[in-house]
Interface confidence: low
């Protein structure tokens, strides 16, 4: 396998010449510091290239930008920086594109030094823009709100929370002091204000308001907070627990009406918790040991948001940057990547296919020795670079690559040992989501999905100019090259539709062609190369999760199988852009992996039982439902989120009724006797990471 | 030093064709695009032609497109301009330059006079 | 088709500054017209000054500078000499029509 035009591998015949009619360049008048890239719509075709060059002169930054605009997926760009009188855009907020297809674009411009701001904004997918000025100067990004476009929010940056519900004609002041404001769902906004402070300190002492009526009237529904988190359907907030510096998570279902303490460590000042992922199930949350460690402890919640499960220790989230590895594996449920800091120092990958609940190293891949990590020199694994490696400034050009419609495919940067190398990486891949993997390219590689796994591109990741692309049609097994210019270039990026269904692929980067140093970018179409539409015969059926075909539950994970129609890797033919993953479930008998330890009990090691924790026998549980006086029972066991197992065990025991009067009432949190059981942390650090590194919230 | 040496230009009846040389030497040819520029018995300059380093990409003007072809040769540092259909408006002194962009000067050569007269 | 005009004649004296400019019928010359300015000498004898609006080419005096004034490229010449009395073109880079010279400026010096 994946021998680039290797023996077992023939040739697409004619491609060159395919390709060659197919590849459409073009040169920009621009020798921009910078691009920012965005695709308005979907299926539409219509980018909007963002060009910045910008200097930053005593206090104050001048530049100019450049706005392109193509409606055949870059094939041709119109310079259409008249539509935007020539004014330079803050690049920082990017191009702020609307929800869905609502063909709704805004780009904030730099009015230095002036009171108010700009924005220039479109309804027509960029195709006309028209110019607002602002009564503010937005702090970042203005946010739509999901469910309708025309209406946005803006925080500015003297913390005052602005609203529009006319895409930006009209703007109403809705609140001071915001220090962090989100969408909830159905036009709900939340946010927290310092009542007689600012942000910048006392912010543990913050209020968490609501508003479900855009602002006409608001609901404190939180206080003494200090910062808080939408996942799923779970709304987080961090909270002073009234022992001086701690603070605890408090969830909510109810968009804030009523919470509940989540089971999880209480942090100090120095320490953080991060939810890594979330969705309407459960979630992942990270928790931060005490002290510079570098690492903390992943917990998986119920379906509450309250009980948690310890999922993976010792792991490594970096204080400093707020680096994480984990990654949600798309291409197959329940499948998660993430990296473990080891008591030698050493970083390792770990991989769970059943949602946290247990993690196993990488299975080495079958065409690659260990390296100069492993002891032993027969048994090692495969180690994944991600953020963190990124973030050390290791040769790696890319994190790992996965794709909901690419089932069953994960692309990514490794090294074979006992640990993370610091050596060039390779590129590996998967194919059944994680289970087993293949060295696919020597050498670090920037890569990309298109028609939904039916080719995968790849780019040398080189100091030289390059012109030379690798494709392959059978989920990189074998590699053909396509020199895509005479001109090499200076690479910068590669550039696809997001969804994976395109099978246009743009490569920019700039060229001492005509000038020196232009922005250029060649878009090569592959419909030529996948020359037929996929038919039935095309695909076969694939078990997901298959690791025992003889076992009557193989491929049971979180109580069912599914079965998917997938493209054989000799199939040369299109997807298209319709593709829809064909996939059959069906439901699993239970079993005692199908249930989590509900709060009090645990797991002893080796054991599938749930057992009452010693620790808390004869102590009233510290834990408060709905916010009132409640009888919690419970028989020690709960399904996991998103189970959908039937039948088989069901692990019925004597109810135990663990009485606590309590009030988790937020607005009087004074009143909470919540005694901590343990203490995890991070860097406190003020950013909101929400959407970056796919990270649902770092405080 | 940069040197630029045209040669190639001569009398010639309309509709017949010609071919200009530059032969470049004293900097890195293959690093540059470069041009064909035309200075017109008026005194007036015109851009004839444009070719990227590597010689994938050329632009013309209109009154030039599709009867000019420029190409390059950079194993012999030498750039051509083939000229064919000629008209007695492409009577000029060729020039071979160096026109650049940020971070390069330009540089030209001594040129060639073509005379397109019957 | 832009059109780029410049000044037809300017005299100047030895040791003066003078000023050449270069405007562009489609709006303000900006750093992305990437202004080129040529000399020319009699006898066909071209040699570039400045590219890309404020680079000096090498072996060019120092007194040659470029740069935008206002929405106009410009050439200045600080304390000019008498070889300096030549004609200026100015060329500026469209996206969409390349290289596109302006009409030349007869600079004389006065000895």
């Known amino acids: 396998r994946s021998t680039e035009q290797g023996e077992s591998c023939s040739g697409l015949l004619g491609a060159d010449a395919k390709l060659a009619g197919n590849t459409h360049q073009h040169i920009f008048n621009d020798l921009s510091g910078s691009v920012s890239l965005a695709w308005v719509g979907d299926g539409t075709g219509v980018i909007l290239a963002l060009t910045t060059f910008q200097v930053p002169i005593f206090m104050i930054t001048i530049g100019q930008s450049k706005l392109y605009r193509s409606e055949d997926y870059g094939k041709s760009f119109e310079d259409v920086t008249n539509l935007i009188n020539n004014t330079f855009i803050r690049s920082d907020f990017g191009i702020a594109i609307g929800p869905e297809n609502s063909g709704k674009v805004i780009l904030t411009a730099d009015v230095s030094g002036s009171h108010g701001s700009r924005i220039f904004v479109s309804s027509d997918f960029g195709k006309s823009f028209t110019h607002q000025e602002l009564p503010f100067v937005p702090l970042m990004q203005i946010t739509y709100n999901p469910e309708n476009s025309n209406v946005l929010l803006a925080l500015s940056n003297k913390n005052e929370l602005w609203l529009s519900e006319d895409f930006g004609t009209n703007w109403k002041k809705l609140y001071d002091t915001v220090c962090l404001a989100k969408w909830g769902r159905k036009g709900t906004i939340f946010f927290t204000a310092n009542h007689n402070g600012s942000c910048s300190n006392d912010r543990g002492m913050l209020e968490l308001e609501r508003t479900t009526d855009y602002g006409k009237s608001f609901k404190t529904v939180a206080s003494k907070i200090y910062s808080f988190g939408l996942g799923g359907k779970f709304l987080f907030a961090s909270v002073m627990t009234g022992k001086g510096t701690l603070r605890a998570i408090h969830v909510s279902v109810d968009d804030g009406d009523t919470w509940n303490m989540a089971q999880l460590p209480s942090v100090g000042q120095e320490q953080f918790y991060s939810i890594l992922a979330a969705n309407d199930d459960m979630v992942f949350m990270h928790v931060d040991e005490p002290g510079d460690t570098g690492f903390g402890t992943i917990f998986t919640s119920d379906d509450r948001g309250i009980v948690y499960s310890k999922s993976l220790d010792r792991h490594l989230y970096t204080t400093t940057g707020g680096e994480t590895d984990f990654t949600n594996v798309t291409s197959l449920r329940g499948v998660y990547i993430t990296s473990v800091l080891s008591e030698d120092n050493s970083i390792q990958t770990m991989i769970t296919f059943d949602q946290g609940g247990r993690w196993t190293h990488l299975r080495k891949p079958e065409n690659s020795e260990c390296d100069a990590t492993a002891k032993n020199k027969n048994e090692c694994s495969l180690h994944i670079h991600a953020s963190y490696s990124i973030s050390q400034k290791l040769n790696v050009p890319m994190a790992p690559l996965s794709e909901p419609n690419a089932v069953g495919i994960v692309i990514a940067h490794g090294s074979v040992g006992d640990a993370i190398s610091v050596m060039v990486p390779d590129v590996y891949i998967s194919d059944d989501g994680g289970y087993s993997w293949t060295k696919m390219l020597e050498g670090p590689h920037y890569y990309t999905i298109l028609d939904s796994g039916g080719i995968i591109v790849a780019i040398e990741h080189s100091s030289r100019p390059i012109n030379v692309i690798k494709f392959s049609t059978d989920e990189g097994q074998c590699w053909q090259t396509y020199t895509f210019t005479r001109d090499p270039i200076y690479f910068t990026g590669l550039a696809s539709e997001p969804g994976a269904r395109s099978m246009n692929i743009s490569i920019w980067g700039f060229t001492e062609s005509f000038l020196t140093s232009q922005w250029v970018s060649y878009t090569i179409d592959f419909k030529d190369i996948l020359e037929r539409n996929c038919e039935e015969k095309d695909y076969t059926i694939w078990l997901a999760h298959s690791t025992d075909p003889e076992d009557y539950e193989d491929g049971c994970i979180l109580g069912y199988k599914e079965q998917f129609l997938r493209l054989r890797k000799s199939s040369v033919c299109q997807n298209g852009r319709d593709y829809v993953v064909t996939k059959q479930p069906s439901i699993c008998l239970c079993s005692l992996e199908d249930f989590l330890c509900d709060f009090g009990y645990y797991r002893p090691e080796n054991d599938s039982k749930c057992v009452e924790q010693p620790e808390l026998k004869g102590h009233d549980l510290e834990f408060c439902l709905y916010g009132r006086e409640e009888h919690l029972t419970t028989n020690g066991y709960r399904k996991i989120p998103g189970d959908k197992c039937q039948g088989g065990v069901n692990p019925v025991r004597e109810v135990k009724d663990l009485k606590k009067k309590c009030t988790s009432n937020f607005l009087s949190p004074e009143k909470q006797n919540s005694k901590s059981n343990g203490s995890a942390g991070g860097s406190g650090g003020l950013n909101d990471i929400f959407e970056a590194q796919k990270i649902e919230w770092h405080e | 030093e940069v040197q630029l040496v045209e040669s190639g230009g001569d009398l010639v009846k309309p509709g017949g064709s010609l071919k200009l040389s530059c032969a470049a030497s004293?900097?890195?040819?293959?690093?540059?695009?470069m041009s064909w520029v035309r200075q017109t018995p008026d005194k007036r300059l015109e851009w004839v032609a444009i070719?990227?380093?590597?010689?994938?990409?050329?632009h013309y003007p209109d009154s030039v497109k599709g009867r000019f072809t420029i190409s390059r040769d950079n194993a012999k540092n030498t750039l051509y301009l083939q000229m064919s259909s000629l008209k007695s408006e492409d009577t000029a002194m060729y020039y071979c330059?160096?026109?650049?962009?940020?971070?390069?000067?330009?540089?030209w050569g001594q040129g060639t006079s073509v005379t397109v007269s019957s | 088709q832009a059109v780029v005009t410049q000044e037809s004649a300017l005299t100047t004296s030895p040791g003066e500054t003078v000023t050449l400019t270069c405007r562009s019928s489609t709006g303000a010359v900006t750093t992305s017209n990437y202004a080129n300015w040529v000399q020319e000498k009699p006898d066909h004898l071209f040699t570039g000054l400045i590219g890309?609006?404020?680079n000096r080419a090498p072996g060019v005096p120092a007194r040659f500078s470029g740069s935008l004034i206002g929405d106009k490229a410009a050439l200045t010449i600080t304390g000019a000499q008498t070889e300096d009395e030549a004609i200026y073109f100015c060329a500026l880079w469209y996206s969409n029509h390349f290289w596109v010279f302006g009409g030349g400026t007869k600079l004389t010096v006065l000895g």
């Open positions: 070719i990227s380093s590597g010689g994938s990409y050329t």
């Open positions: 004293g900097f890195t040819f293959s690093s540059y695009g």
């Open positions: 890309g609006t404020n």
């Open positions: 330059a160096r026109l650049c962009g940020p971070l390069c000067s330009g540089y």
